[in-house]
Interface confidence: low
């Protein structure tokens, strides 16, 4: 990998070993402006594999609100507007990082956690394995 | 919101004001096992709105590697395997949290950052604006 010289102005690290604790500034630098997934696009309604967005709230997690996509149909919407079960609507999942309060209920102490969230749905052709 | 009593065993907070600095344990609790998006499913190839996955690497960011989806076609794949331009392949985007080294090149000091990533693609009916 790339070796980058350490900045001499870095804060001291209390613990150089893993599991390591680091300082994180929660004043988020947001490169985006829109946070409501329903406002950001109407793809969830216009897709051939449409989905609903469900609000998942957990006060022990940062961010406390995450939106989860649930595909509306087993199949996909065809040109006639009907559900075609020859195709499958499937969730597109992504691993994201969240902060989990640890110990619980502490405002200033967290552990990084990876969780799997469904972001939206896509329409796929099913695979059939022909067993000899 | 829900008011949760503070745990008396919490570490002391140096700064109670925003922008606030918190302690984060980087020993990730991973609820999932598969991190390579190409292994987790082959939806990117089987979708009617297929996409390619591009590796985005940034040593100043945690996680340093993020996979970005780029839709292969403007249109969607129809039942005959051809691209149908009456439909559109569009990226499904999600805001995710990452840690950005701040000051730069510091191993133990970060700022939370929100970035927008494309996770996959879905096929949508285009919106046609009829101009009077």
């Amino acid at each position: 990998g790339i070796t980058i010289p350490r900045n001499p102005g870095c804060p001291n690290s209390e613990d150089k070993n893993f599991p390591r604790t680091v300082m994180v500034n929660l004043n988020i630098h947001n490169r985006n402006t829109n946070t409501n997934p329903k406002r950001s696009s109407d793809y969830y309604n216009r897709s051939t594999s449409p989905w609903n967005l469900h609000r998942n709230e957990d006060p022990e997690r940062y961010p406390s609100v995450i939106w989860e996509a649930k595909c509306r149909h087993l199949g996909c919407i065809n040109a006639d507007g009907n559900v075609d079960y020859h195709m499958n609507s499937v969730p597109i999942q992504q691993e994201i990082l969240v902060l989990r309060r640890e110990p619980p209920h502490c405002p200033n102490s967290f552990r990084l956690e990876k969780i799997l969230v469904s972001v939206g749905c896509t329409c796929v052709t099913p695979i059939v394995h022909h067993v000899a | 919101g829900i008011t949760i009593p503070r745990n008396p065993g919490c570490p002391n907070s140096e700064d109670k004001n925003f922008p606030r600095t918190v302690m984060v344990n980087l020993n990730i609790h991973n609820r999932n096992t598969n991190t390579n998006p190409k292994r987790s499913s082959d939806y990117y190839n089987r979708s009617t709105s297929p996409w390619n996955l591009h590796r985005n690497e940034d040593p100043e960011r945690y996680p340093s590697v993020i996979w970005e989806a780029k839709c292969r076609h403007l249109g969607c794949i129809n039942a005959d395997g051809n691209v149908d331009y009456h439909m559109n392949s569009v990226p499904i985007q999600q805001e995710i949290l990452v840690l950005r080294r701040e000051p730069p090149h510091c191993p133990n000091s970060f700022r939370l950052e929100k970035i927008l990533v494309s996770v996959g693609c879905t096929c949508v009916t285009p919106i046609v604006h009829h101009v009077a």
Partner: antibody, heavy 125, light 107 residues
Framework: EVQLVESGGGLVQPGGSLRLSCAAS????????MAWVRQAPGKGLEWVAT????????YYRDSVKGRFTISRDNAKNSLYLQMNSLRAEDTAVYYC??????????????????WGQGTLVTVSS | DIQLTQSPSSLSASVGDRVTITCRAD??????MHWYQQKPGKAPKLLIY???NSEIGVPDRFSGSGSGTDFRLTISSLQPEDFATYYC?????????FGQGTKVEIK
């Protein structure tokens, strides 16, 4: 080997309720859509309901909509059918059915390769 | 709802006979047509899926064909254990529907 074992059938009066269970083993239960299919005495097969692997989506035949609820507990590898406001025409053997293991439409398998032995529901006064 | 009509409703045949059962849908079900065998007091058994694919362990005397709205199940040489009721199933559109069944009896 895939095994499906239904239970919970019996005699119930019209307007009554019954909850059927199906214990599944031998396959990754939470991955697959599951279904209930019924067969009235001396009659043909009739699909009743389907539930997705995650439990997020359910599908019913019109005659049972609003009366029957299909659900699942993936931690217990169990499928359920809660039947309320039962009618004489609901009298049937109820089968729990699961999809084939070789079909990789991912979370959905759209036909039934494995069936339980069935449980008889009799609605009569 | 998609209606499936099987014909004949019943048939009498002898061991060794070639038997064909047809299933007609009132609208296209593409390739999502499947065939089951059921014996008295038993659960149905999958024979053929997706029109023409034989389920594992099913004897090769059973075959399926057809497309769109017209489908056929053929038993090339009827065996004593084949006397049963046969059903077609479409899973193209909810509600999933079965044909009314074809009873194959010994002549």
């Amino acid at each position: 080997e895939v095994q499906l074992v239904e239970s919970g059938g019996g005699l119930v009066q019209p307007g009554g309720s019954l909850r059927l269970s199906c214990a599944a083993s031998g396959f990754p239960f939470s991955t697959y859509a599951m279904a209930w299919v019924r067969q009235a005495p001396g009659k043909g097969l009739e699909w009743v309901a389907t539930i997705r692997g995650s439990g997020e989506s359910t599908y019913y035949r019109d005659s049972v909509k609003g009366r029957f609820t299909i659900s699942r507990d993936n931690a217990k590898n169990s499928l359920y059918l809660q039947m309320n406001s039962l009618r004489a025409e609901d009298t049937a053997v109820y089968y729990c059915a699961s999809p084939p293991q070789y079909y990789e439409g991912s979370i959905d398998r759209l036909w039934f390769a494995h069936w339980g032995q069935g449980t008889l529901v009799t609605v009569s006064s | 709802d998609i209606q499936l009509t099987q014909s004949p409703s019943s048939l009498s045949a002898s061991v060794g006979d070639r038997v064909t059962i047809t299933c007609r849908a009132d609208e296209s079900v593409r390739t999502l047509m499947h065939w089951y065998q059921q014996k008295p007091g038993k659960a149905p058994k999958l024979l053929i899926y997706l029109v023409s694919n034989s389920e594992i362990g099913v004897p090769d005397r059973f075959s399926g064909s057809g497309s769109g709205t017209d489908f056929r199940l053929t038993i090339s040489s009827l065996q004593p254990e084949d006397f049963a009721t046969y059903y077609c199933l479409q899973t193209y559109s909810y509600p999933f529907t079965f044909g009314q069944g074809t009873k194959v009896e010994i002549k």
